[in-house]
């Protein structure tokens, strides 16, 4: 049966800065086709259990699937198909009119160069360990990859890291993000965001670990010299990080222009698209270069801020210079100044 389980089946994810997330395209017969999210009897707004696409993520050398559902509604110059039958089957597909097709999006974890432990080592009081020390980032349930509370394991001893806001630890955070294969340090996360709020019914393996660590050397260059063991503390902050490799990234699109390469910038928060509001932190063209790249267009030709005379104009706001640094978008409920961007069109 012709499906994404076929060992020779080829797929790719496009319209994003990462090979592990984007719009699903499949190779079928004589070329690449965008898969419509209405395929297999689904509605264009329906989100699927992402584990059904694990074979696709695996083939792309990415990690486990995080989400499978509608990607973005935009003009798509390439061929698009709607498929029928079982999810993931391509035996019965028909060409779709591009304006009827809402493309299917898939987000897989970025690949990790080394595999972190999938389960936490059991809490124990065995003698001091000899196994190499390692780190783990524990995200909120359904949370992001490369964002969460840092746990340090030295052999079978593991726990969180006590952290004081006044600690000058920028070098350490960069070292930790790097060690986790997550890029560089972006910011500290409040514990609620990082997922520390403990659910009383949470399974045993997610209960707080019995060991706690304190930063011993913030300029350390190997893990064994960074932390020392302390008595677990009832109160106080624990180290929670957001690294540049976090996923899924904010997705963008250009709407209302004469081609896919120009229009007002919109971004997606969850399943919702909204206008991206102008931000004083993004006055250079760097942000728009990134947006143009995500649309698979050339570099920025121009960008202009549209007048926000309307106090009811709403949208989303990213406080960073680049969207790829935005771990969360903030809602702006009034005076949202939209931005119209024109990128070079590779296929004029």
């Amino acid at each position: 049966r012709l499906s994404w389980y076929d060992p020779d089946f080829q797929a790719r994810l496009t319209r994003s800065n990462s090979k592990c997330q984007g719009q699903l395209e499949v190779y079928l017969k004589d070329g690449w086709h965008m898969v419509c999210s209405q395929s297999w009897g689904r509605s264009s707004k329906q989100w699927e259990d992402p584990s059904q696409a694990s074979k696709v993520c695996q083939r792309l050398n990415c990690g486990v699937p995080l989400s499978l559902g509608p990607f973005l509604v935009t003009y798509t110059p390439q061929s698009s198909i709607i498929c029928y039958g079982q999810l993931g089957s391509f035996s019965n597909c028909s060409h779709s009119r591009n304006d009827m097709c809402h493309s299917l999006g898939l987000t897989c974890l970025e690949p990790q160069k080394t595999t972190p432990p999938t389960t936490r080592p059991p809490p124990t009081t065995t003698p001091e360990p000899t196994a190499p020390p390692r780190l783990q980032l524990v995200a909120q349930s359904g949370g992001q990859h490369c964002a969460g509370v840092v746990e340090f394991y030295s052999g079978s001893l593991g726990g969180t890291i006590s952290y004081e806001a006044q600690d000058k630890t920028q070098d350490l955070e960069n070292f930790l993000c790097n060690n986790l294969q997550c890029g560089s340090f972006l910011k500290h996360l409040p514990e609620t965001e990082a997922g520390r709020a403990q659910d009383p019914g949470e399974p045993r393996e997610h209960q707080p670990l019995p060991i706690q660590w304190k930063i011993q050397n913030s300029s350390c260059t190997s893990l064994e010299h960074c932390f020392r063991k302390i008595k677990p503390q009832k109160s106080g902050r624990v180290l929670a990080l957001l690294c540049s490799g976090f996923q899924p990234k904010v997705q963008s699109r250009l709407v209302g222009g004469s081609s896919i390469c120009e229009g007002t910038v919109e971004v997606r928060q969850g399943a919702q698209w909204a206008a991206l509001c102008d931000s004083s932190s993004a006055r250079s063209s760097l942000r728009w270069e990134e947006v143009c790249r995500e649309q698979q267009c050339g570099s920025v030709n121009s960008y202009r801020v549209l007048d926000a005379g309307d106090p009811t104009s709403r949208g989303l706001f990213c406080p960073h210079q680049k969207l790829s640094q935005c771990h969360e978008l903030w809602e702006r409920n009034s005076y949202c100044k939209k931005v119209f961007v024109t990128c070079q069109d590779p296929n004029p």
Epitope: R1, L2, D6, D8, F9, Q10, R12, Y27, L28, K29, D30, G31, W32, F90, S91, N92
Partner: antibody, heavy 120, light 106 residues
Amino acid sequence: QVTLKESGPGILKPSQTLSLTCSFSGFSLSTSGMGVGWIRQPSGKGLEWLAHIWWDDDVYYNPSLKNQLTISKDASRDQVFLKITNLDTADTATYYCVRRRATGTGFDYWGQGTTLTVSS
Amino acid sequence: NIVMTQSHKFMSTSVGDRVSIACKASQDVGTAVAWYQQKPGQSPKLLIYWTSTRHTGVPDRFTGSGSGTDFTLTITNVQSEDLADYFCHQYNSYNTFGSGTRLELK
């Protein structure tokens, strides 16, 4: 095992129509993902893809020859046919029948070829 | 139409050598490239598809590499039975072939 065998007239005159038949075994054109097509090769020259037909009756033609070509199949008899109209001496070549899967695994099986000479 | 250019019509080699046959696409074809071997009086045989995947039964001395517009078929430890014509083929958009490279003995 997979085999494909071409048959054709051998010699035709310019402006005539060529009819080729490919008879195959070892797979079925009713199986999803299967396709059969035609490629030609003038003596001592390169390969030129002509047309392809798929399990679901979808057909693809070489855009530069599209108006001259018609491909069809009889899946129950394991046969594929190609018609080329308005022949020219430049159509003199060996014509190969090939199998291909929809997942893009190349032309994985080829027939032995049938030679056509177009001459007045 | 995408044009596939094999700049070397002929390449000379010796048994035991390593030889690389190049193929250039006129536009980006991703990794949708296959390689075929054709001996005199025979039909072409598929060697490699999706740039680097060997077809069933193809010896591991044949390897493919590249992406975008530049592709290479490498034969390590050339055997006398490898002397033949080699064609590249792109199938990213329809199907087009290179004009072929003949591998011959020095």
